[in-house]
């Protein structure tokens, strides 16, 4: 039985050429996560694996980092950034936990950032 | 190319242990995951688990109370140990790769099979 | 578990017809779908991973599609060797698990 939940950041904005921290927490489950996929859409991102580490799709390898944590950062921000992410949280034995992360980058440098969120 | 061969007893008592060993040839068995697969006659796949060098399991929670896997990097091998087995247990057993890319991006797709080995639970 | 569901189980078809395949997940499984083909006595052969994304050495005439729950796989132009057992599985959650299978036979 799934009994975790899983926090994000929620929706987010941010400037045109900064930068922006995608964070998601699972909590609730006693479950060993397994494998962390970061998704744009269905583009996958980064991968974060309990055996492998951490893996960056070539096409994203110049913008994206990984971390903080199992979060992502995403660099050099531009409008087509704009957009619906995923953390999908692969667990043993619980199963698949997904949080949803809206993104808005916007032209004005007088973009209101988010509360960024903290793993206590 | 990376190949793999199961090997084990084709007959087992019920209440006994079933033991199998894949040997994988031309590559290593080191960071990869590797998988257990079992197909009874005549019907569908159901995945036992899967392994990784560091000796991390993950089972299938239907069996995980009879599953035990095992990795020997030095034999380039792992192994499936399958206990108190019943006629239910009857069926041909795969060994797996689990083809790990940022394209696939997850576990569980299985690349590169073993041919299989049938194996009979019966007295 | 998530399960899947394929249809139909059986089907029967000529050399060079298209031959489609559905496949549908109990949940959500966005993209993780992947698909084999079994043919009687050998072991599954890895068709195509991410739902529609080729695996490497297999003909064009092998093609998938959709998201989410619901799935295709398409054979384009149905040759002699296609003749044979075709399973889904998903890989988005663990167990990995798999449909009951579609025989292609010849009509």
């Known amino acids: 039985m799934m009994t975790g939940t899983i926090e994000t950041t929620g929706n987010i904005s941010a400037e045109k050429g900064g930068s922006i921290i995608l964070q998601c927490h699972l909590s609730s489950t006693t479950a060993q996560v397994t494998q962390v996929n970061w998704e744009q859409q269905d583009q996958l991102l980064a991968i974060c694996n309990a055996d492998l580490g951490w893996h960056i799709s070539p096409s994203f390898k110049d913008r994206v980092a990984p971390g903080p944590g199992l979060g992502l950062t995403l660099q050099s921000l531009t409008v087509n950034d704009t957009g619906e992410y995923f953390c999908i949280y692969h667990t043993y034995p619980d199963g698949t936990y997904t949080g949803r992360i809206f993104l808005e980058v916007l032209e004005s440098s007088v973009a209101e950032h988010g509360a960024r969120f903290q793993i206590p | 190319q990376v190949q793999l061969q199961e090997s084990g007893p084709g007959l087992v008592k019920p209440s006994e242990t079933l033991f199998l060993t894949c040997t994988v040839s031309?590559?290593?068995?080191?960071?990869?995951?590797w998988s257990w697969i079992r197909q009874p006659a005549g019907k569908g796949l159901e995945w036992i688990g899967r392994i990784y060098t560091s000796g991390s399991t993950y089972y299938n929670p239907s069996l995980k109370s009879r599953v035990t896997m095992s990795l020997d990097t030095s034999k380039n091998q792992f192994s499936l140990r399958l206990s108190s087995v019943t006629a239910a247990d009857t069926a041909v057993y795969y060994c797996?790769?689990?083809?790990?890319?940022?394209?696939?991006?997850?576990?569980?797709?299985?690349?590169?099979w073993g041919q299989g080995t049938m194996v009979t639970v019966s007295s | 578990d998530i399960q899947m569901t394929q249809s139909p189980s059986s089907l029967s078809a000529s050399v060079g017809d298209r031959v489609t395949i559905t496949c549908r997940a109990s949940?959500?499984?966005?993209?993780?779908l992947n698909w084999y083909q079994q043919i009687p006595g050998k072991a599954p052969k890895f068709l195509i991973y991410?739902?529609?994304s080729l695996q490497s050495g297999v003909p064009s005439r092998f093609s998938g599609s959709g998201s989410g729950t619901d799935f295709t796989l398409t054979i384009s132009s149905l040759q002699p060797e296609d003749f044979a057992t075709y399973y889904c599985q998903q890989s988005y959650s663990t167990p990995p698990t798999f449909g009951q299978g579609t025989k292609v036979e010849i009509k």
């Open positions: 949940q959500s499984i966005r993209r993780y």
């Open positions: 797996a790769r689990e083809g790990f890319t940022m394209v696939r991006g997850v576990m569980g797709a299985f690349d590169i």
């Open positions: 991410d739902a529609s």
């Open positions: 031309g590559g290593s068995v080191t960071n990869y995951y």
